[in-house]
């Protein structure tokens, strides 16, 4: 009797219900809401995230522009149809019929319409921009000392390979880290950067969905980053198709 | 896969001292917050102290206060258990344990996500 066997628990997903019933009595794992198996090793989709979300109990500037196709999530929380490798379906749609189409991180990228609503592929979010207000501090914090510690955090906590967060900016108080993943360069088990830019947001707004009670412990040479503001920018691989009246809205 | 490796584990009489280490062999070691868990004979896993990974912070349950210290080095990816006045009922297999990186822990197990195998400690009377 080991003290690993009494964590039968997911790391990386709280929103799980596990058992020791896998093969060998090995701990098994699977996701509110859609009772899907997930790999606790790694992150779990965003799509499954929401799904068991929804589930629950109800409770020289240096800075980047976004591009003018560039995505913000203002839809809010919606109960997401996922796919059997837990992505969301290029199309959802709600209790009242209404669909739209979104891009792989579930952001709606077109105009809402009916069930006849057409959506061919799901779009890849290739580019996404998180940007950040940091709480006041005595000074500003060294930009190479945040650099790395945030390249870290990405590596170690969310186990996003390196090569995709392609840059972080710095002028006090904005931080914007960049992602960059495109279809090509994503291999088989690479963490998803839309999946990473979820973790890291819900951590920011203190509901870390890794095991335990604790939360994001974020400190660049000791000194605490506390964020008070997330902007969280998305660009896809084909632009968004709006019609122009919500864009004169 | 992390590796956590307990030693220092021995008999000792009552009153006397050990020093138990865990060393951390995954790379995510000065990140995570590091704690000490124990198991006597037919009882229920216990927390007995927790650290952050600046070592600034540090976490006793009553029983092992003002007897115990915990202390990391992060060159060494080592997290330390002093263990002073020791007490008959402080026998226990004890376990080191590392949260996931960059999470806040405390003495509640369920904060930490890899587990040593444990070291034995034995006090007699």
């Known amino acids: 009797h080991t003290a690993a066997q009494d964590n039968c628990t997911c790391p990386t997903n709280k929103m799980t219900v596990c058992s020791p019933d896998g093969p060998g009595g090995r701990c098994q794992c699977r996701a509110l809401g859609s009772g899907m198996a997930v790999d606790c090793s790694t992150l779990t989709s965003k799509c499954l995230l929401l799904k068991a979300r929804m589930s629950a109990p109800k409770n020289a500037r240096t800075l980047v522009r976004p591009s003018e196709h560039a995505l913000v999530d203002n839809d809010g929380l919606y109960d997401p149809d996922c796919d059997p490798e837990g992505r969301f379906k290029a199309r959802q749609c709600n209790q009242t019929s209404v669909c739209w189409c979104v891009n792989s991180v579930g952001v709606r990228r077109t105009d809402k319409g009916d069930l006849s609503l057409r959506c061919d592929e799901l779009v890849r979010t290739h580019h996404i921009l998180i940007d950040l207000r940091h709480r006041p501090t005595a000074g500003a914090f060294n930009h190479s000392d945040l650099d790395a510690e945030l390249r870290r955090l990405f590596r170690e906590r969310y186990r996003l390979h390196p090569k995709f967060v392609a840059a972080v900016h710095y002028e006090q108080p904005t931080i914007q880290i960049e992602l960059r993943q495109n279809t090509s360069q994503k291999a088989a088990g690479d963490v998803d950067i839309g999946d990473a830019a979820y973790y890291f947001e819900r951590d920011i707004k203190g509901e870390s969905l890794f095991q335990g009670r604790g939360g994001l412990d974020l400190r660049v040479r000791g000194e605490p980053l506390q964020v008070e503001r997330t902007l969280i920018y998305y660009l896809d691989e084909i632009p968004p198709k709006f019609s122009m009246k919500r864009l004169t809205a | 896969q992390v590796q956590l490796q307990e030693s220092g584990g021995g008999s000792v009489q009552a009153g006397g001292s050990l020093r138990l280490s865990c060393v951390d062999s995954?790379?995510?070691?000065?990140?995570?917050?590091m704690g000490w868990f124990r198991r006597a004979p037919g009882k229920e896993r216990e927390g007995v102290s927790v650290i952050s990974p600046y070592g600034d912070s540090t976490y006793y349950a009553d029983s092992v206060k003002d007897r115990f210290t915990i202390s990391r080095d992060n060159a060494k990816n080592t997290v330390y258990l002093q263990m002073n006045s020791l007490k008959p009922e402080d026998t226990a297999m004890y376990y080191c344990?590392?949260?996931?990186?960059?999470?806040?822990?405390?003495?509640?197990?369920?904060?930490?996500?890899?587990w040593g195998q444990g070291t034995q400690v034995t006090v007699s009377s």
């Open positions: 344990a590392a949260s996931w990186p960059y999470q806040t822990a405390s003495l509640d197990a369920m904060d930490f996500t890899d």
């Open positions: 995954g790379s995510t070691y000065s990140r995570r917050y």
